[in-house]
Amino acid sequence: ESGYAQNGDLEDAELDDYSFSCYSQLEVNGSQHSLTCAFEDPDVNTTNLEFEICGALVEVKCLSFRKLQEIYFIETKKFLLIGKSNICVKVGGKSLTCKKIDLTTIVKPEAPFDLSVIYREGANDFVVTFNTSHLQKKYVKVLMHDVAYRQEKDENKWMHVNLSSTKLTLLQRNLQPEAMYEIKVRSIPDHYFKGFWSEWSPSYYFRTPEINNSPGEMD
């Protein structure tokens, strides 16, 4: 079957809502950047629909996206990262809808990893550490991190701490004793770039110790 729409197909297409959103990931694979777009409406029939980006590219005028199930994806070194590009949904060579976007304003960082929590008995606190691939990157190096933790039994009662470093101290006195906690972290560009929260890191689980009363203390 031809990838080109018949006139009837175009008329039908024009009735649909082709709103879409995109995010970029810079230096996601060595010096390669990626751009991912998807339709806002998950029920859009994507047969014959293509995405194309034009402008603010190096050495080429336009690039076509690859389709992976319901998302559209490019991995390339050819993003100039200066100025606005035009991203269009096309059918049969005709643009249905377009957006002008500066790719440095829709950056989604990679998820943090290696999250761990160490209890320091003498200090009566928990040291939370994690890693991020962005420390090694040329562009998106400065991130704000959101550490979220909750007592496992409190399903929706998340506590959040924002920080720019990859180390956080939680005081034992601010946590319930003898309780299981879940903790996770995500990142967002904080300076020079704009965009979206990363995916959450895998959760880490830790248990708080019971309160040990000193010999002189009353129950």
Epitope: C54, A56, G83, K100, D102
Partner: nanobody, 118 residues
Framework: DVQLVESGGGLVQAGGSLRLSCESS????????MGWFRQAPGKEREFLAA????????HYSDSVKGRFTISRDNAKNTVYLQMNSLRAEDTGRYYC???????????WGQGTQVTVSS
């Protein structure tokens, strides 16, 4: 009504330095890419350098890489071109441009003249 005003040009000896400034009165300056170009007598206008909205990303032509540096101050609505190790062939009129939108610069200044004597 004037939107981009370049300054800092002049006569300089080969090997010397100059710093050009371009002040913008365009309201979207802090979210716009900026660029510097030059036009030598009898030649086409050539791209020299560009900088992204935040200053984090820069791009240079091979002819000025390592000698010229583009920077910006979003609080002052100004973009700069620091030019070192100037050569006679750098002589020309220097223009700044704003808002690189799908491969077209939307706004242009009137330019400032730079003359490098050997």
């Amino acid at each position: 009504d004037v939107q981009l005003v370049e300054s800092g040009g002049g006569l300089v000896q080969a090997g010397g330095s100059l710093r050009l400034s371009c002040e913008s009165s365009i309201s979207t300056f802090s979210s716009d890419a900026m660029g510097w170009f030059r036009q030598a007598p009898g030649k086409e206008r050539e791209f020299l350098a560009a900088i992204g909205w935040s200053g984090a990303v820069t791009h240079y032509s091979d002819s000025v890489k390592g000698r010229f540096t583009i920077s910006r101050d979003n609080a002052k609505n100004t973009v700069y071109l620091q030019m070192n190790s100037l050569r006679a062939e750098d002589t020309g009129r220097y223009y700044c441009a704003e808002d690189y939108d799908t491969d077209v610069w939307q706004y242009w200044g009137q330019g400032t003249q730079v003359t490098v004597s050997s």
